[in-house]
Amino acid sequence: SAHAHPRDSCPLGPGRCCHLETVQATLEDLGWSDWVLSPRQLQLSMCVGECPHLYRSANTHAQIKARLHGLQPDKVPAPCCVPSSYTPVVLMHRTDSGVSLQTYDDLVARGCHCA
Amino acid sequence: SAHAHPRDSCPLGPGRCCHLETVQATLEDLGWSDWVLSPRQLQLSMCVGECPHLYRSANTHAQIKARLHGLQPDKVPAPCCVPSSYTPVVLMHRTDSGVSLQTYDDLVARGCHCA
C-alpha cells in the first residue's frame, strides 16, 4: 500500500535522527526584550536531526519524497525534521495600559516528524 | 508582535527559494507497479528550494527557528521547505476483483512554506 510503516529506529546512531531538543534563548536573542516581560530566559523545544529513508515519515507524501530523493537527489530534497504538533505557551506582554498575558499555540514544538 | 510578516520575495534569485515544483515519476520509481494502474508517468508536486531568513515562515516557531539559526547555526537548523497543504488525488488500484479507486489526501503538495 502507499503507507509503508514509518521507521522509528535511527540507523545513524543515537541522537542523530529527527527528534525534539530543548534550546535556551534569551528575549534579546529573539528580539523580544521590548515587549515581553517574562520569562526572561525561554526554554524552547525544536526539531533537529536528520531524516534518513522512511524515518518518522509524516505521511504518504514524505514517503514518496524519501524514495524519489534516493533516485533523483539533485531534483528532490530529502524529507526534513519539522514539528508535528505544538505546545501552547503563555508570554507576559508589556502593553500601553500595563501588562497582559497572551497564549501562543505555535511557538514551542511538542513532537517532530520528517516531512 | 511575535508574528513578523513572513517575507515573500526571494532574496536568492528566481526559483531558488521554497516553492512548489512538478516532478515526474514512474510506478517503478515509487515501488507501486504491483498495485497501481497508470498508463503514463505520474506527475507529483513537491516543495523544493531554500528558506532564507523569514521567507514564507509557517508560523511563530519558524520565525524563532530562523532567528536562532542565525545565532546558533550548529545547534539550530534553518527552517526547511515543506508542504503547507495537500491536494487530494485518486489512484487506480489493482484488486483481486479488478480495479478500484482510492483517494489520497496527503500525496500531492498544494502549497509550501518554511517550517
Epitope: - | 512538478t22 497508470s38 498508463p39 503514463r40 508536486s45 491536494t87 485518486v90 479488478g98 478500484s100 479507486l101
Partner: antibody, heavy 123, light 108 residues
Framework: QVQLVQSGAEVKKPGSSVKVSCKAS????????VSWVRQAPGQGLEWMGG????????NYAQKFQGRVTITADESTSTAYMELSSLRSEDTAVYYC????????????????WGQGTLVTVSS | SYELTQPPSVSVSPGQTASITCSGD??????VSWYQQKPGQSPVLVIY???NRPSGIPERFSGSNSGNTATLTISGTQAMDEADYYC??????????FGGGTKLTVLG
C-alpha cells in the same frame, strides 16, 4: 457550492479560432483537473482534453492535437479552451467539466459541469 | 483506440427496472462512470467506480461491470429518469472515452 460558469455563445467563420472561458468558484481551483467536452447537435459527448492547474500541464485527445490549446489562469480561477482552424463540423456545445486529479490518467469522474457554450461555425 | 458501444435506445415502464449496457473489450478490468443528461441540460455524474453514487443521486441508480459489459441499472424507474445516459472510461494511453449514449424512454 462549486460552480463552473462559461462564456457566452459564439458565431465563427470557417478557418477562424474561438476561445471559450470557464470560471470556477466555490472550490480550490488548483486542486482539480478541468476538461473540455463537446457535444455536436444530436450527438454524444466527446472529450477534447484538459488541464491540471497545479501541474500546469495540458493533455489533449489525439483527434484535437495541434488544433486545441487549453490553458488556466490560477489568479482568476479560469480555464480556457481555444480551438483553431474551425470548420462546420465543429459546431457544438462546448462544456468544461471538473473532476479529481486521477494519477496517471489525469481526467475523468466529472463531478461538476459548466452550463455549456454553443459555438456555431458558419460562413 | 478503445471503443464503448451502447444501445441507442431503451424503453421501460414506470416502476420497472431499466438496464443500460456499455460494451467494450475486457471492460470489466476498467473503471466505468455513468452520466445522465436531460434535454437542454449539462451532464450529471450518477455512478462511478462500479457502483458508487455521488451525493444527491438516488439509491435506485446502481452499476455493475464484468467481462465485456458494464451495466447501469435503474430500479423503480420514474418519469424523471427519462434522459440520455453515457458510459465513460479510459483508453490504453489514459485518454477519456465516452460511449455513444442511450436514450432512456419511460413509457406512459
Amino acid at each position: 457550492q462549486v460552480q463552473l460558469v462559461q462564456s457566452g455563445a459564439e458565431v465563427k467563420k470557417p478557418g477562424s479560432s474561438v476561445k471559450v472561458s470557464c470560471k470556477a468558484s466555490g472550490g480550490t481551483f488548483r486542486s482539480y483537473a478541468v476538461s473540455w467536452v463537446r457535444q455536436a447537435p444530436g450527438q454524444g459527448l466527446e472529450w477534447m482534453g484538459g488541464i491540471i492547474p497545479i501541474f500546469g500541464t495540458a493533455n489533449y485527445a489525439q483527434k484535437f492535437q495541434g488544433r486545441v490549446t487549453i490553458t488556466a489562469d490560477e489568479s482568476t480561477s479560469t480555464a480556457y479552451m481555444e480551438l483553431s482552424s474551425l470548420r462546420s463540423e465543429d459546431t457544438a456545445v462546448y462544456y468544461c467539466a471538473r473532476g479529481p486529479i486521477i494519477m496517471g490518467y489525469q481526467f475523468g469522474l466529472f463531478d461538476h459541469w459548466g452550463q455549456g457554450t454553443l459555438v456555431t461555425v458558419s460562413s | 483506440s478503445y471503443e464503448l458501444t451502447q444501445p441507442p435506445s431503451v424503453s421501460v415502464s414506470p416502476g420497472q427496472t431499466a438496464s443500460i449496457t456499455c460494451s467494450g473489450d475486457n471492460i470489466g478490468s476498467h473503471i466505468v462512470s455513468w452520466y445522465q443528461q436531460k434535454p437542454g441540460q449539462s451532464p450529471v455524474l450518477v455512478i462511478y467506480d462500479k457502483s458508487n453514487r455521488p451525493s444527491g443521486i438516488p439509491e435506485r441508480f446502481s452499476g455493475s461491470n464484468s467481462g465485456n459489459t458494464a451495466t447501469l441499472t435503474i430500479s423503480g424507474t420514474q418519469a424523471m429518469d427519462e434522459a440520455d445516459y453515457y458510459c465513460q472510461t479510459w483508453d490504453s494511453i489514459g485518454s477519456v472515452v465516452f460511449g455513444g449514449g442511450t436514450k432512456l424512454t419511460v413509457l406512459g
